[in-house]
Interface confidence: low
Amino acid sequence: EAHKSEIAHRYNDLGEQHFKGLVLIAFSQYLQKCSYDEHAKLVQEVTDFAKTCVADESAANCDKSLHTLFGDKLCAIPNLRENYGELADCCTKQEPERNECFLQHKDDNPSLPPFERPEAEAMCTSFKENPTTFMGHYLHEVARRHPYFYAPELLYYAEQYNEILTQCCAEADKESCLTPKLDGVKEKALVSSVRQRMKCSSMQKFGERAFKAWAVARLSQTFPNADFAEITKLATDLTKVNKECCHGDLLECADDRAELAKYMCENQATISSKLQTCCDKPLLKKAHCLSEVEHDTMPADLPAIAADFVEDQEVCKNYAEAKDVFLGTFLYEYSRRHPDYSVSLLLRLAKKYEATLEKCCAEANPPACYGTVLAEFQPLVEEPKNLVKTNCDLYEKLGEYGFQNAILVRYTQKAPQVSTPTLVEAARNLGRVGTKCCTLPEDQRLPCVEDYLSAILNRVCLLHEKTPVSEHVTKCCSGSLVERRPCFSALTVDETYVPKEFKAETFTFHSDICTLPEKEKQIKKQTALAELVKHKPKATAEQLKTVMDDFAQFLDTCCKAADKDTCFSTEGPNLVTRCKDALA
C-alpha cells in the first residue's frame, strides 16, 4: 500500500532505535571516509525530520522518497569534493541516477586503518558512559569498512556486542571474558560480510533471476517439506529483501525482512517443523536464527528425480510451455533431495540440465538424447567432492596456518601478478575453510566448503576488478558466479609470468616483529612466502619448506636474543643468502 510519507511509515514500522541504526549504516556505507560525529549529526537531523513527519504526514518534504531525502543530506556535506573526489559528481544527478551513482562509488577495499579493539578496561569505561554512542561507533566502523554488510544483520551483531559488554564489563577479569566472545562475533560477522557481498554481486552482475535461483536451491535444502509454491513465495520475498539491502534501501530491507520472519513464523506448518525455537526469539535474533535454521527432516517417500524430469514423456512439452517454472521445479526437487550438496553445485547441475534440454528438445528423438542426463551429472558432483576430500586431508595434516601457507603457494603460482597483500588476505581466508568446515559431519562438508570458497573468491574478483593484473583471474572472474570456484581450482602455474627479481629488502626483518601479536607475525611470514614464490614460481614444496623453516628458526632465535637488534642486523643477511642458495 502507498503511504503519504515513506519516512514516517518506516520510522513507525522500525521504531526509533532500529531506524537510527539503519540510517547510520546507510550513511557510513555511502560516505566511507566521514567521521562518526559527522554521520551521527546527519542521523539526528534525519530522525528529527522523521518525527515531524510522523506527527504530520503532510508537513513539508515528508512526501519525498527516502533516496531523495538521504541523497540531499549527503550532498549537503561540506568539502564533499575535497574528501571524495568524483563521488561529488553524483550530486549533480537526479534520482534514481544519483543513488545508482553513489552505489557505484562504494569501495570494497577502503584505505582505512584496521578496526582495532581498545583494551578491555577502556572499552568498558566508554560503554558504561554512553552505550548508545559506543554502539553507534561500532555500526559506523563496521559499515564503512564493509559497504555491503547486510544491515539488519549488522544490527543483530551490534546487539550481540552489547550483550557481551553488558555481561563482561561486570566481571573482575574483563579481558578474558571479552576476548574470546568478541573474537567469535568478529569471525561470524566477517563471514556474514563476504557471504552478503556475494549475494549483492550475484544481483548486480546477473540480476534478480540468478539470485532467485540461488534462493530456491538454498530454501529447498532447508525446507524439503515445503511445496514448490511455498518455496517460490519465500524465494521471491527473500530476493526483494536482498535487492533492497544491496541497493542501499536499508529501511525497506529491514522492514521487509521483519515481515518475512513474521510470515515464516505464522506459516510454520507449510514450511518446516524446525522454526519454533527461532520464532520464540525477539526480532533481530529471530531473523538471524531463521537464516541459519537447521534443515528439516527430508520426506521419506520422495520418488526418484528421474520420474518427472527424464522418464516422463512430456518433458520437452513441459519445458517449452514454461521454461523458468519447469527448471525451477527441477532445481527445487533436486535441492530438497540433496542437503549434502553446495548451492553452487546444485545450480551447476540445473544449468547442465537446462543446456541438455535446449539441445535435446530440438532433436528428432529427445528422450534418447536426454535419457543419460543424470549420469552426466556424475563428473560435476565428483569434482567438488574430491576437492573437499583433498583439502580437508591436507588441513588435517598441516593445521590452519600450514594449510593457509599451502594455499598461498598454490594461488601465488596461479596468479603471481596479484598484489601480495591481496594474495595473503585471500589465502588466509581460504585457509579458514578447514577450521570452519572440515570438522563438520561428512554430509555437511561439501556445502560448507564450496559455498564459503565461492564467497571468498568473489572478494578476490572484486579486488582484482579495481586493478586487473592477471589474465588467469580475469578469465575466472568473468564467467558465471557458480563456475568461478571450479575455474580457480583448475588454474595451474602461470607460464606467462616473468619472475620478480630477488630484492634483499623484501626479506629483511627488524626486532619490532618480535612484539607483534601472533596473527601479525603470521602475516609477515606469509608475505615473505608469497614474495619467495613470485621470485621462484616453480620452486618445489620442499625448497619452500626449507626456506620457511629457516626463516622461522631465525625469528625464534633473534626474538629470544639479549640484543635483538644486533641479532637481526647480523643474522638477517645470512638468512637472505641461505634463501637465495636454497632456491637457486
Epitope: N225, C265, E266, Q268, A269, T270, S273, L275, Q276, C279, D280
Partner: nanobody
Framework: EVQLVESGGGLVQPGGSLRLSCAAS????????MSWVRQAPGKGPEWVSA????????RYAESIKGRFTISRDNAKKTLYLQMNSLKPEDTAVYYC????????GSQGTQVTVSS
Amino acid sequence: EVQLVESGGGLVQPGGSLRLSCAASGFTFGSFGMSWVRQAPGKGPEWVSAIDSGGTDTRYAESIKGRFTISRDNAKKTLYLQMNSLKPEDTAVYYCTIGQSTSRGSQGTQVTVSS
C-alpha cells in the same frame, strides 16, 4: 490445505468448566508445537497456552495458570484446552494456532462466562 477447526465453546457460569478441542488437518500435526490464543471483545489477541510437539512441555499465561490445562492427542490430530474455575474475564473467542503465534488462521470458538 492447512485447517484448524475449534469446538467446545459456549455459555457457562462463573466457576464452571469447558473443554475446547481443535481438530487439525493438512499438515504433520505431530511435528509442531501448538498454542491457544484468545481475543476478548475490543482487545488484541492474547496468548493463553502452548504445548510442544510431543506433548511433554507445556506453558501457560499468568492469568490462567492453575485453572487451564493444555494437552494433545497426536494420533487424533487434536489439541485440547481444559478450562476450570472460569471467570467473567475469560470471556473471549478462543483460537488454536500452530507454533507459539498469536496470529489467527481459523474461525475460533466463543466462550462466554456470565451469571
